[in-house]
């Protein structure tokens, strides 16, 4: 099974404001999986619709 993401490096612990950093394998860049109630590329916005 080929994983589509890796854990982000330690250097990216603050990359996501309210979420978990994942390093996308294909795009070769970090991305954020937002915690419930947050949205945005860096999970920086409260989801007003939540």
């Amino acid at each position: 099974v080929v994983s589509h993401f890796n854990d982000c490096p330690d250097s990216h612990t603050q990359f996501c404001f309210h979420g978990t950093c994942r390093f996308l394998v294909q795009e070769d860049k970090p991305a954020c999986v937002c915690h419930s109630g947050y949205v945005g590329a860096r999970c920086e916005h409260a989801d007003l619709l939540a």
């Epitope: 330690d10 390093f23 860096r42």
Partner: antibody, heavy 116, light 106 residues
């Protein structure tokens, strides 16, 4: 294709300031951190610091904290490295870089010479 | 995180299999790069993620990882491979580099 194009060589006087640039194509600098690395003549490589262009947050190696300022302009997809109060110790080649797990990208380097 | 390249120079012959080692003081989970640098030139990225060969780099170069130990292998040394090689960890900040291993022809 991702490319990092750095500004040209600089010859400056001691005590002066200088601002080096790194313009990125093929990659949105808001998507990851941009870093700067120093290499003095005949020496190894030294990390200066990084910027998160999405919000301007920076992190520096302790020895560069009061010497270097890293900024970014997302509209032009450009990262900058500025130095103040230059001395001969700042004579070096400076590289901008962005590293992924599978790929990495470096600029061609900017030679900074500090001399009176 | 300290990166130690145990040999600052290696005396080699053309055609040799060359192994350059780098040890991390902490786990860096394969966030390691290898560079080749020739005098007067910028560092050339060979490998990222410990094992991923950059496009255009000859297949005689390869990287491997075992715990905190990382290795760059050159299967059959060519004239153009005579250079200084650096490892770098980019797991944590500050990024840190090994001191370099210079290949010299016997």
């Amino acid at each position: 294709e991702v490319q990092l194009q750095q500004s040209g060589a600089e010859l400056v006087r001691p005590g002066a300031s200088v601002k080096l640039s790194c313009t990125v194509s093929g990659f949105n600098i808001k998507d990851d951190y941009m870093h700067w690395v120093k290499q003095r003549p005949e020496q190894g490589l030294e990390w200066i610091g990084r910027i998160d262009p999405a919000n301007g947050h920076t992190k520096y190696a302790p020895k560069f904290q009061d010497k270097a300022t890293i900024t970014a302009d997302t509209s032009s997809n450009t990262a900058y490295l500025q130095f103040s109060s230059l001395t001969s110790e700042d004579t070096a080649v400076y590289y901008c870089t962005r590293m992924g797990l599978r790929r990495g990208y470096w600029g061609q380097g900017t030679t900074l010479t500090v001399s009176s | 995180i300290q990166m130690t390249q145990s040999s600052s120079s290696l005396s080699v012959s053309l055609g040799d299999r060359v192994t350059i080692t780098c040890k991390a003081s902490e786990h860096i989970n394969s966030w390691l790069a290898w560079y080749q640098q020739k005098p007067g030139n910028a560092p050339r990225l060979l490998i990222s993620g410990a094992t991923n060969l950059k496009t255009g780099v000859p297949s005689r170069f390869s990287g491997s990882a075992s715990g905190k130990d990382y290795t760059l292998n050159i299967t059959s040394l060519q004239t153009e491979d005579v250079a200084t090689y650096y490892c770098q960890q980019y797991w944590g900040t500050p990024w840190t580099f090994g001191g370099g291993t210079k290949l010299e022809i016997k």
